[in-house]
């Protein structure tokens, strides 16, 4: 008789998880130096023990913990760019200006990117069919703790000047409901952080608006403000031309507004 | 070629006021941030104030409250406005330019002014 399985509203997890976990952290700790001491099968093991055998809706910071014990890493804190709603010009701009790290350049970010994963209370099998939906089914889900764990973490964890990109396409610039506006904004460290400053990144050829000018951006500054960290805010219109200018920025066409 | 040139040091008494200018050519202003440093003598360089290209701030614990930066577009020129000047303030100052994002490392600075004397009496 097959066995009754919670059906959950979103996708379920990712295929070949623990192989695509396991050969990112080796990956990883081959090509960053700092972080070869790492044992990629204990990242596993601890990663696994966050949602084996749990209820998925019933997942908190503290199953984490483990993992975040194995998978610490100092980035340089003055050189933070988190994003919200814009994760591959981010990436982009990280690949080529390498002194700076988004979330997903440190081994727990990098390990989790873009996967989906969840298991079921009191089996040891993982869920490929389905996994909880934040909206539709709950919040406290592994994937949304997972997410929510470490980017409490980066966020403490920066200095001096913090740069966030945005998306100018989005209705909502600045969305209070993102992690970035939920969890990171709330967790910069106002003694140890001077300056956010927000980029935002115009999708339209021919958008000139200010977009720093957005009541969304303004709300961003207000909360910013009330944290006693300052606020600074830059139109990137061109992104093209943005990431031309990051590789070559010696370029002539470098020296009218990007 | 990108040059950098300050202007503005001199001679003050405590508790008075200087603003420096950073003035640059051959290249894309814009896109500098620009840092500021100092250089008493026999001591290290040492970092003053930074301003990104969108105009976001960074102090020396130092200076906070006292030194004020900013920067005219336009201009190409950078500024950094010294209130209530302190003897322990005198140094040779410097601008320094990198791309898009500060540093405290003078390392990191790609291009450099020659320097401009401030001393501050008491």
């Known amino acids: 008789v097959p066995r009754w399985r919670q059906q959950w509203s979103g996708p379920g997890t990712t295929k070949r998880f623990p192989e695509t976990v396991l050969a990112r952290c080796v990956k990883y700790t081959e090509i960053h130096p700092e972080m070869r001491h790492v044992d990629c099968q204990s990242v596993w093991d601890a990663f696994k023990g966050a949602f084996i055998s749990k209820h998925p809706c019933n997942i908190t910071e503290e199953d984490y913990q483990p993992l975040m014990k194995l998978g610490t890493q100092t980035v340089p804190c003055n050189k933070i760019l988190l994003w919200s709603r814009i994760k591959d010009l981010a990436h982009q701009f990280t690949q080529v200006q390498r002194d700076m790290f988004t979330l997903e350049d440190t081994l727990l970010g990098y390990l989790a990117d873009d996967l989906t994963w969840c298991g079921e209370f009191n089996t040891s099998k993982i869920n490929y069919q389905s996994c909880p939906d934040w909206r539709k089914d709950c919040s406290n889900n592994p994937v949304s703790v997972f997410w929510k764990t470490v980017s409490r973490r980066f966020a403490e964890a920066a200095c001096d000047v913090v740069h966030v990109m945005l998306n100018g396409s989005r209705s909502k610039i600045f969305d209070k409901n993102s992690t970035f506006g939920s969890v990171e904004v709330h967790n910069l460290q106002p003694e140890k952080v001077q300056t956010l400053e927000a980029w935002v990144i115009h999708g339209g050829r021919e958008d000139s608006r200010d977009l720093c000018q957005d009541p969304t951006i303004k709300e961003l500054e207000s909360i910013i403000s009330k944290r006693n960290i300052q606020f600074s805010c830059k139109n990137i219109y061109r992104p093209d031309k943005f990431l031309q200018c990051v590789k070559n920025p010696e370029d002539s066409s470098c020296t009218s507004e990007i | 070629e990108v040059q950098l040139v300050e202007s503005g040091g001199g001679l003050v008494q405590a508790g008075g006021s200087l603003r420096l200018s950073c003035a640059v050519s051959?290249?894309?202003?814009?896109?500098?941030?620009m840092g500021w440093f100092r250089q008493a003598p026999g001591k290290e360089r040492e970092f003053v104030a930074a301003?990104?290209?969108?105009?976001?701030?960074l102090y020396a614990d130092s200076v906070k409250g006292r030194f004020t930066l900013s920067r005219d577009n336009p201009k190409n020129t950078a500024y950094l406005q010294m209130d209530s000047l302190k003897p322990e303030d005198t140094a040779v100052y410097f601008c320094?330019?990198?791309?898009?994002?500060?540093?405290?490392?003078?390392?990191?600075?790609?291009?450099w002014g020659q320097g401009t004397q401030v001393t501050v009496s008491s």
């Open positions: 301003i990104t290209w969108g105009s976001g701030t």
């Open positions: 320094a330019g990198k791309y898009f994002t500060t540093a405290r490392l003078p390392a990191e600075y790609k291009y």
């Open positions: 051959g290249g894309a202003f814009n896109n500098f941030a």
